[in-house]
Amino acid sequence: SSLGGTDKELRLVDGENKCSGRVEVKVQEEWGTVCNNGWSMEAVSVICNQLGCPTAIKAPGWANSSAGSGRIWMDHVSCRGNESALWDCKHDGWGKHSNCTHQQDAGVTCSDGSNLEMRLTRGGNMCSGRIEIKFQGRWGTVCDDNFNIDHASVICRQLECGSAVSFSGSSNFGEGSGPIWFDDLICNGNESALWNCKHQGWGKHNCDHAEDAGVICSKGADLS
């Protein structure tokens, strides 16, 4: 039995690790699933952040794992992306859904960040150059669309390269190759890693490598 407290919990089950799998919510002491109507990257971002798996990788419209059972607690979940918990997102009401079945259980793939790397290249030292990120074993770049000093600040801090001195686009440090992992990132400058900034999803972009972004950090400028 329970004695009050917030009667809601969140978990991902039947995935490869605690940061992927079928979305399950515990409401009123009962675990249930979330229907995938209207499922979005914003909802996935909220879930990943809530579970301490801050990188939203993808939002499968159905759980890649086996179908769930029991109650379907949420449907038509609509998040802005900045909610602190999934149940702060709008939905149809608890236990209310439009004839969903467990074949429509929503799934999430986050990253715990342990398989991610970042580096700066072609800048003459480790603290300046083109931004490259290793994700799923492949090095790729970041598009310069809407890139600004807040993004640069996150990168410099993450790489322990001091503060951001400048940022550049238009492949100022040469064109990279491979995937373009990020486009239209939204950072406030306080994130602990670039992939914790709000984004559209890994590999989602409308760019080419002529738009690869770069930065110069204070420790890199000192070495120039």
Epitope: S1, G4, T6, V27, Q28, E30, D88, K96
Partner: antibody, heavy 116, light 107 residues
């Protein structure tokens, strides 16, 4: 359709235990829903007391601490409220209420007076 | 526990009037607010759940709105049969708590 009917003693002496029964018709209490007790004090203030789920899990209002117990008899399709060490402050109309999550279905209520 | 502060306590209106009742939560309850109607001598009945969703069979003159801490319940055109006490209630966290009620009287 779900129908709920409360029954109880009407009058209880202070320090005694209160036992109320909710008889459910038209629906099995093991099929679905949370089966709640809610009381309404004179002056109309409502207080959620606790529930027992269709699977038998219970949850209680912390304000009632260790005084409350909700149980059920599935063979009779009934669930019960026991409240120990009652005082005059427990005088109220007691409702049994059910629903998936929301308080959809209400009984008519039974009035309890605590008095010596 | 989350405290739900409901205003006003009493409303005296004429048939045909528009009525608004407000409920303020002591902390954010997201969209998780329900509204109930209790007619004299009856048990409460669910009118609105999840801020704005009308329960089955509830007339469309009853509406709800709000988010976070501030919520509103409106009867667009009051009818004589709407004489009742109206309660808000938060569904966000346990224990679920109710407002103190608004008694609606018809002139």
């Amino acid at each position: 359709d779900v129908q709920l009917q409360e029954s109880g003693p009407g009058l209880v002496k202070p320090s005694q235990s209160l036992s109320l029964t909710c008889t459910v018709t038209g629906y099995s209490i093991t099929s679905d829903y949370a089966w709640n007790w809610i009381r309404q004090f004179p002056g109309n203030k409502l207080e959620w007391m606790g529930f027992i789920s269709y699977s038998g899990i219970t949850s209680y209002n912390p304000s009632l601490k260790s005084r409350i117990s909700i149980t059920r008899d599935t063979s009779k399709n009934q669930f019960f409220l026991q409240l120990n060490s009652v005082t005059t402050e427990d005088s109220a109309t007691y409702y049994c209420v059910s629903g998936t999550y929301y308080f959809d279905y209400w009984g008519q209520g039974t009035t309890l007076t605590v008095s010596s | 526990s989350i405290v739900m502060t409901q205003t006003p306590k009493f409303l005296l209106v004429s048939a045909g009037d528009r009525v608004t009742i407000t409920c303020k939560a002591s902390q954010s309850v997201s969209h998780d607010v329900s509204w109930f109607q209790q007619k004299p001598g009856q048990s409460p009945k669910l009118l609105i759940y999840y801020t704005s969703n009308r329960y089955t069979g509830v007339p469309d003159r009853f509406t709800g709105s709000g988010y976070g801490t501030d919520f509103t319940f409106t009867i667009s055109t009051v009818q004589a049969e709407d004489l009742a006490i109206y309660f808000c209630q938060q569904d966000y966290s346990s224990p679920r708590t109710f407002g103190g009620g608004t008694k609606l009287e018809i002139k």
